[in-house]
Amino acid sequence: QDPYVKEAENLKKYFNAGHSDVADNGTLFLGILKNWKEESDRKIMQSQIVSFYFKLFKNFKDDQSIQKSVETIKEDMNVKFFNSNKKKRDDFEKLTNYSVTDLNVQRKAIHELIQVMAELSPAAKTGKRKRSQMLFRG
Amino acid sequence: QDPYVKEAENLKKYFNAGHSDVADNGTLFLGILKNWKEESDRKIMQSQIVSFYFKLFKNFKDDQSIQKSVETIKEDMNVKFFNSNKKKRDDFEKLTNYSVTDLNVQRKAIHELIQVMAELSPAAKTGKRKRSQMLFRG
């Protein structure tokens, strides 16, 4: 059994999240994940899910009673989602830490917008896919 | 020329983001995007970038002078990043709107954590990759 399982059970106790009533009114993440089978679609959704957990864990970083559990889970997320690639993890964290209310950040984001948009679709990266998409776009 | 280009130029004027000094101290997104060639890695990063822009645009939704530009760009993001798939866009928006300070959301997130973790690595989806990874993990 992966070590994260024991630590996640510990977090369930701490957050009082083991009760069946927690599942009322549907799921947060599991239902959405079930909708997407393509790896790239899954990564779009998982990226948001992982950043949610990182934010959640950050809010409880000073709570000693769950620190070991949180760090074990974060490490396993690093292994599983980022394939233990520190650069991938660091780039991800940079993106999640940008403040949307910072004026300099806003200006930079708008300054980069055209180039970001040009790279958004997979088509932008491969001529072959671009051509095949053109047929459907008229 | 894609319609978003003209509208992005309009936003550059509004945000005073056309000046060369905006590029000082490096880029927000472009440098990071340059690091990742694999489609699934790019989606991890682009997911955060797109959610940043959506948040930014939300903050300016009542500003009439840029409303048309914002709507055009959001529509083009929808086409390019979500491939005009409304369900994909809706699921994404749901994930970005969860509040990390809402106690019910916290409990649900912790309740689902074990299953989310089990699905995080591509290996979890394909037996073949899982076996090959086991060799390295001891």
């Epitope: 070590p3 974060k74 490490e75 292994v79 233990s84 520190k86 | 060639k37």
Partner: antibody
């Protein structure tokens, strides 16, 4: 001050076994991944194995063909390398090196700290 | 194979500048951090550049690291060469199975 001290090296016959140890001090050992790297006489550095800090993920160089086993004891601040079916090609200085904090809190730098190494000689 | 290829040796006079290249054979150089180590004869490897371009404290700013995506390579540059720079230099990165990979090493001789 961060310190890594390897021990357990020595002379062993082909086919024999050895267990190397690395005693760590000066940092919270249980938070950092750890590595073993070796260097044959007059040759370059060769990575041997790595292990994460809390989740027991282990990684090995393909060339080892399952003969080596990495482990750690976080209570004793120690890293180990169990080496079996040793051949003359395994003769080298074996270094222990500290990795980074894979949970991301105060992450640190991979391979920033190295021990002095312990010499393993495989000869008949 | 995820080989990192370095020149076997380089030599230059004191005060000059040298660059040691480290070319990645498979995989994209920018997607994994690159580190550089200095190893003097009989000594322990010492990190001189980490995470592509960063210098640990105590390493002089004459030493710098860079990445060139067009050649899929990393470089270590040492300016104002000094006799104490004479050593073996190793680049190091990772592969997609989270294996650590080292370059073959470059012997730097200060003439």
């Amino acid at each position: 001050e961060v310190q890594l001290v390897e021990s357990g090296g020595g002379l062993v016959k082909p086919g024999g076994s050895l267990r190397l140890s690395c005693a760590a001090s000066g940092f919270p050992f249980s938070r950092y991944s750890m590595h073993w790297v070796r260097q044959a006489p007059g040759k370059g550095l060769e990575w041997v194995s790595s292990m994460t800090s809390r989740t027991n993920h282990k990684y090995y160089a393909d060339s080892l063909k399952g003969r080596f086993l990495i482990s750690r004891d976080n209570d004793r601040d120690s890293l180990y390398l169990e080496m079996n079916s040793l051949g003359v090609e395994d003769t080298a200085i074996y270094f222990c090196a500290r990795g980074y904090d894979t949970s991301g809190s105060d992450s640190g730098v991979d391979f920033q700290y190295w021990g002095q190494g312990t010499l393993v000689t495989v000869s008949s | 194979n995820f080989m990192l290829t370095q020149p076997h040796s380089v030599s230059e006079s004191p005060g000059k500048t040298i660059t040691i290249s480290c070319t990645r054979g498979r995989g994209y150089i920018a997607s994994y951090y690159v580190q550089w180590y200095q190893q003097r004869p009989g000594g322990v490897p010492k990190i001189v550049v980490f995470e592509d371009t960063q210098r640990p404290s105590g390493v002089p700013d004459r030493i710098s690291g860079s990445i060139d995506t067009s050649t899929n390579s990393a470089s270590l540059t040492i300016s104002g060469l000094q006799t104490e720079d004479e050593a073996d230099y190793y680049c190091q990165s990772y592969d997609d199975a989270n294996h650590v990979i080292f370059g073959g090493g470059t012997k730097l001789t200060v003439l």
